[in-house]
């Protein structure tokens, strides 16, 4: 009955500070409303990066000021986090909640280690 969530172990952010990964869940119920949350774990502290609730078959809608965007297809969510800097390197955990109809189910992935490398500044040209 427990819900399993799968996500890649490692992702390297692009030079523009964008990282994308797939979060897939094995739904034990027939949910119509799903909440997806990205958590960041650093030094045993867990913080929320972004969250979106969507109706199955519809697109994810994150808040306008969110650093996350995403699309959904069946039990799979494609997540993109932008604006990342080297200091944002860390473990990003995908949390999925089947909100409606009851019963509620929780699924938490093992996390994706996102590595972010700040680009070297361009050398001054004379």
């Amino acid at each position: 009955k427990a819900m399993h969530v799968a996500q890649p172990a490692v992702v390297l952010a692009s030079s523009r500070g964008i990282a994308s990964f797939v979060c897939e869940y094995a739904s034990p119920g027939k949910a119509t409303e799903v909440r997806v949350t990205v958590l960041r774990q650093a030094d045993s502290q867990v913080t929320e990066v972004c969250a979106a609730t969507y109706m199955m078959g519809n697109e994810l809608t994150f808040l306008d000021d969110s650093i996350c965007t995403g699309t959904s297809s069946g039990n799979q969510v494609n997540l993109t986090i932008q604006g990342l800097r080297a200091m944002d390197t860390g473990l990003y955990i995908c949390k999925v909640e089947l909100m409606y109809p009851p019963p509620y189910y929780l699924g938490i992935g093992n996390g994706t280690q996102i590595y972010v490398i700040d680009p070297e500044p361009c050398p001054d040209s004379d």
Epitope: A2, M3, H4, K95, Y104, L106
Partner: antibody
Framework: EVQLVESGGGLVKPGGSLRLSCAAS????????MNWVRQAPGKGLEWVSS????????YYAESVKGRFTISRDNAKNSLYLQMNSLRAEDTAVYYC???????????WGQGTMVTVSS | EIVLTQSPGTLSLSPGERATLSCRAS??????LGWYQQKPGQAPRLLIY???TRATGIPDRFSGSGSGTDFTLTITRLEPEDFAVYYC?????????FGQGTKVEIK
């Protein structure tokens, strides 16, 4: 300091009503799901009801469904439990509890006692 | 509903001894299991979540293990303040359920 403080408990007759409140402080209340959990005298813990951060999703234990109503006011950092048609078996200490980001109930209030007796 | 069964009901031990508490689920809860400590007249306090991760501020003498249906809470060296009732809880699906508790008392 992260804190939850319950109030509103007391003695009520069978069939009566009571409204419990839980005041939250020290964290962004509007970002967390909240719960009510009760504990009858000398007994274990029993989950009663849950409400999502924006009140969109609400869940009840079968034992209270149709009699209890959970609600919240994010502007007031407060959680409520309206209890109607109270029975002797509802006698318990009622705790409000926050749902942590990873799922467990990570912060609990000190509890408020509800006694249903004629 | 997922039923959690804790054993033993009571554990009589002396300070400094090791305590091993068991929690068995009626069906798999994966690792969505927490342990709570409750002292008389106080609210429960989260000790362990995710079956094995210590909550903030919890001493390392407390450890959790297990997955699926069988879980264990171990207290390596009992301190006087550890004598209390311990509850397991599954939070992977509603209704959220608790075990009936294990009382750890001074022998």
């Amino acid at each position: 300091e992260v804190q939850l403080v319950e109030s509103g408990g007391g003695l009520v007759k069978p069939g009566g009503s009571l409204r419990l409140s839980c005041a939250a402080s020290g964290f962004t209340f509007s970002s967390y799901s909240m719960n009510w959990v009760r504990q009858a005298p000398g007994k274990g813990l029993e989950w009663v009801s849950s409400i999502s951060s924006s009140s969109s999703y609400i869940y009840y234990a079968e034992s209270v469904k149709g009699r209890f109503t959970i609600s919240r006011d994010n502007a007031k950092n407060s959680l409520y439990l309206q209890m109607n048609s109270l029975r002797a078996e509802d006698t318990a200490v009622y705790y409000c509890a926050r749902v942590g980001l990873m799922g467990p109930f990570d912060i609990w209030g000190q509890g408020t006692m509800v006694t249903v007796s004629s | 509903e997922i039923v959690l069964t804790q054993s033993p009901g009571t554990l009589s031990l002396s300070p400094g001894e090791r305590a091993t508490l068991s929690c068995r689920a009626s069906q798999s809860v994966s690792r969505y299991l927490g342990w709570y400590q409750q002292k008389p007249g106080q609210a429960p306090r989260l000790l362990i979540y995710g079956a094995s991760t210590r909550a903030t501020g919890i001493p390392d003498r407390f450890s959790g293990s297990g997955s699926g249906t069988d879980f264990t809470l171990t207290i390596t060296r009992l301190e006087p303040e550890d004598f209390a009732v311990y509850y397991c809880q599954q939070y992977g699906s509603s209704p959220w359920t608790f075990g009936q508790g294990t009382k750890v008392e001074i022998k």
